[in-house]
């Protein structure tokens, strides 16, 4: 009686269960009454990452430098190439098909999380007691200067964009 279902890593064709090709190999010929499945290794710059019956291997992803991309991990016959972005840039999507410049945090905002090759800069507003007076992709909010520890007094209050201005204590009693 011909099978209606096959074991794991097999497929049903012409009423026979044939072995799938292992990762890194493509299907040439289905198994027959006389032969096992015929598989061939993927060529240079090709891959297949699953047990399969594909007759063509997939092309490795190309990390296009014109799009700001570079190779993070070279592909093998069983894995695709992984692209990442050049320094100062990050991927626009999970697939990392193109890159954009990391955003900078405006004055009044500091870097909460520095950008990586796959994620943009995360900014946060500087809370009371902190400031940022530059547009930067790296600078965090800095704490206001503590005038007291310098034996000085606040002459001008700080904001989220400016530090406090300290001055000498009024000596008149």
């Amino acid at each position: 009686e011909p099978p209606t279902a096959c074991r794991e890593k097999q497929y049903l064709i012409n009423s026979q269960c044939c072995s799938l090709c292992q990762p890194g190999q493509k299907l040439v010929s289905d198994c027959t009454e006389f032969t096992e499945t015929e598989c061939l290794p993927c060529g240079e710059s090709e891959f297949l990452d699953t047990w399969n019956r594909e007759t063509h291997c997939h092309q490795h992803k190309y990390c296009d430098p014109n799009l700001g991309l570079r190779v993070q991990q070279k592909g093998t016959s069983e894995t695709d190439t992984i692209c990442t972005c050049e320094e100062g840039w990050h991927c626009t999507s999970e697939a990392c098909e193109s890159c954009v410049l990391h955003r900078s945090c405006s004055p009044g905002f500091g870097v909460k999380q520095i950008a990586t090759g796959v994620s943009d800069t995360i900014c946060e507003p500087c809370p009371v007691g902190f400031f940022s007076n530059v547009s930067s992709a790296f600078e965090k909010c800095h704490p206001w200067t503590s005038c007291e520890t310098k034996d000085l007094v606040v002459q001008q209050a700080g904001t989220n964009k400016t530090d406090v201005v300290c001055g000498p204590q009024d000596r008149l009693r």
Epitope: N14, S19, V28, S29, T32, F34, T35, E36, E38
Partner: antibody, heavy 113, light 112 residues
Framework: QVQLVESGGGLVKPGGSLRLSCAVS????????VYWIRQAPGKGLEWMGM???????DYSTSVKGRFTISKDNAKTSVYLQMSSLRAEDTAVYYC???????WGQGTLVTVSS | ELQLTQSPLSLPVTLGQPASISCRSS???????????LHWYLQRPGQSPRLLIY???NRFSGVPDRFSGSGSGTDFTLKISRVEAEDVGVYYC?????????FGGGTKLEIK
């Protein structure tokens, strides 16, 4: 439908060469394997070798080094190049597809002086 | 090279009676993937061989159910439950597990 047709047989002197062709139709040689079998007059069947779909070849010990199997995917033909022929190579040569029961009609090779 | 030994060489049978042919291999015919590529052919007089049984026990399409195959490892058998006139010819076992593929020497079935 699937067909295999052999040609190229004939009379050849010992030490001579001959090329048999197996023209196929109804299937692709890049997806199916084909093998050659021979049968000497009044004798049994002998497997000569095969051409796999992927292009690799295998041979029997009796003909390895003397016979070469090749194929032309575009011309849809498989060839058996026979050299240094001997009297014991006299036989009907069949090409066969490696699934189902698809045989050519056979072509007779006679090696005699 | 793997040898297939068939017995008997000649098999005279009365019409309607059963017949049995043995095929012994010089090494196991189980493949690395668990398949056993042992097959049976019938060559009728003046014709090319015709596939009867593939992979030990699978009847090829159009083959009458009076033909059956069995066995494993190195010992295999072809049985005909009731011989008919059209069954006359030479029966060959064949293996395609190991390269080079090989055939048995043949068993000639004739009617008594």
């Amino acid at each position: 439908q699937v067909q295999l047709v052999e040609s190229g047989g004939g009379l050849v002197k010992p030490g001579g060469s001959l090329r048999l062709s197996c023209a196929v139709s109804g299937f692709s040689l890049s997806r199916y394997s084909v093998y050659w079998i021979r049968q000497a007059p009044g004798k049994g069947l002998e497997w000569m070798g095969m051409m796999w779909g992927g292009g690799s070849t295998d041979y029997s010990t009796s003909v390895k080094g003397r016979f070469t199997i090749s194929k032309d995917n575009a011309k849809t033909s498989v060839y058996l190049q026979m050299s240094s022929l001997r009297a014991e190579d006299t036989a009907v040569y069949y090409c066969v597809r490696t699934d189902g029961d698809y045989w050519g009609q056979g072509t007779l090779v006679t090696v005699s002086s | 090279e793997l040898q297939l030994t068939q017995s008997p060489l000649s098999l005279p049978v009365t019409l309607g009676q059963p017949a049995s042919i043995s095929c012994r291999s010089s090494q196991s015919l189980a493949s690395s993937q668990g398949n056993t590529y042992l097959h049976w052919y019938l060559q009728r007089p003046g014709q090319s061989p015709r596939l009867l049984i593939y992979k030990v026990s699978n009847r090829f399409s159009g083959v009458p159910d009076r033909f059956s195959g069995s066995g494993s490892g190195t010992d295999f058998t072809l049985k005909i439950s009731r011989v008919e006139a059209e069954d006359v010819g030479v029966y060959y076992c064949s293996q395609s597990t190991h390269v080079p593929w090989t055939f048995g020497g043949g068993t000639k079935l004739e009617i008594k």
